[in-house]
Interface confidence: medium
């Protein structure tokens, strides 16, 4: 079946200085700014644009080694980066993949608000666990707050 | 059964003040941004105010800074404070969840309290 | 802000007909497009989320398309408890703003 998740979650920092951070330069900012929850992420095919596989890596100790994701869509113009988990992870025998969108839309404040809708094919009649959603979304939150967090203390950075 | 139910309102006058509560059951009120809405006499829908799971909370300018969304999480309970009232903020004024399956539609409202502000 | 406009303001139709509301968004988004039914006295009620996707317990008569600044909410077979006021509604950005409604009458 395909079980939706949506979350929305508001940021101080302005849309596209956001998308710029967080998602065109995720793949470098994440581990530098998050180590305890990603330490690397490679390109294994494409050069970034949809199509794209990357590997993440997690450090030792977390309930994952890795996750392979594709690269489904990127528009700059809207703030918008699709991609699917396809391998590791939570994927396996219960789960076939998971379809990410995030949105990062202005917010009337000057900051903007990440709209990140979740789509989980699973395998057979098999139904997804509402605790692992939570936890993933926790995981995506404090990914954003750490991004938020560098880009305060470093004014410069990706304007 | 998941329900919302909204109380508060009344008669009051202008430059009164008021606090409507919606007492949610069957979901937690801080797993889900939550927002008032309110339908003035013979009007259409008007969004108010939101109140994101986070806490983050955001205001249509019609209201910002005479209303405050809160939410009390062991009472399970979300509030609006409404000061400097006016006339013009006579309504129904509902409480509705946003959806986390949905894509941030509205799929619980609660029944609606009235609220009246005249001299 | 995100302005919608509905259309027609008011209709009159007969059991059976199909009916079609159109609401069209002043900027152009994806995804975050309700609509609501209303009957007088009482809250609004979802019939259609994310643009097409049918809320759980809503007759199958009821579906909804569109994207960009353009979407419809369609009935297939009007059925005499289908009057009301029905309202589009965006999700996608604050402040939500929802169409001024349809009031559909049965003939």
């Known amino acids: 079946g395909v079980f939706n998740y949506e979350a929305e979650t508001p940021s101080v920092i302005p849309a596209a200085r956001l998308f710029k951070a967080f998602i065109l330069d995720g793949d470098k900012l994440l581990p530098k700014v998050a180590p305890e929850a990603v330490s690397s992420v490679e390109n294994i095919e494409g050069n970034g644009g949809p199509g794209t596989i990357k590997k993440i890596t997690f450090p030792e100790g977390s309930p994952f080694k890795y996750v392979k994701e594709r690269v489904d869509e990127v528009d700059r113009v809207n703030f918008k980066y699709s991609f699917s988990v396809i391998e590791g992870g939570a994927v396996g025998d219960a789960l076939e993949k998971v379809c990410n969108e995030i949105k990062i839309v202005a917010a009337p404040d000057g900051g903007s608000i990440l709209k990140i809708s979740n789509k989980f094919h699973t395998k057979g009649d098999h139904e997804i666990n509402a605790e692992q959603i939570k936890i993933e979304k926790e995981k995506a939150v404090g990914l954003l707050k750490a991004v938020e967090s560098y880009l305060l203390a470093h004014s410069d950075a990706y304007n | 059964e998941v329900q919302l139910v909204e109380s508060g309102g009344g008669l009051v006058q202008p430059g009164g003040s008021l606090r409507l509560s919606c007492a949610a059951s069957?979901?937690?009120?801080?797993?889900?941004?939550m927002s008032w809405v309110r339908q003035a006499p013979g009007e259409g829908l008007e969004w108010v105010s939101v109140?994101?799971?986070?806490?983050?909370?955001y205001y249509s300018d019609s209201v910002k800074g005479r209303f405050t969304i809160s939410r009390h999480n062991s009472k399970n309970t979300l509030y609006l404070q409404m000061n400097s009232l006016r006339t013009e903020d006579t309504a129904v004024y509902y409480c509705?969840?946003?959806?986390?399956?949905?894509?941030?539609?509205?799929?619980?409202w609660g029944q609606g309290t009235m609220v009246t502000v005249s001299s | 802000d995100i302005q919608m406009t509905q259309s027609p303001s008011s209709l009159s139709a007969s059991v059976g007909d199909r009916v079609t509301i159109t609401c069209r968004a002043s900027?152009?988004?994806?995804?975050?497009l309700n609509w609501y039914q209303q009957k007088p006295g009482k809250a609004p009620n979802l019939l259609i989320y994310?643009?097409?996707s049918l809320q759980s317990g809503v007759p199958s008569r009821f579906s909804g398309s569109g994207s960009g600044t353009d979407f419809t909410l369609t009935i297939s077979s009007l059925q005499p408890e289908d009057f009301g006021t029905y309202y589009c509604?965006?999700?996608?950005?604050?402040?939500?703003?929802f169409g001024q409604g349809t009031k559909l009458e049965i003939k």
């Open positions: 509705a969840r946003h959806s986390n399956w949905n894509f941030d539609a509205f799929d619980i």
């Open positions: 069957g979901f937690t009120v801080s797993s889900n941004s």
């Open positions: 109140i994101f799971s986070g806490g983050i909370t």
């Open positions: 900027q152009s988004f994806d995804t975050y």
């Open positions: 994310a643009t097409s």
């Open positions: 509604q965006q999700s996608y950005s604050i402040p939500y703003t």
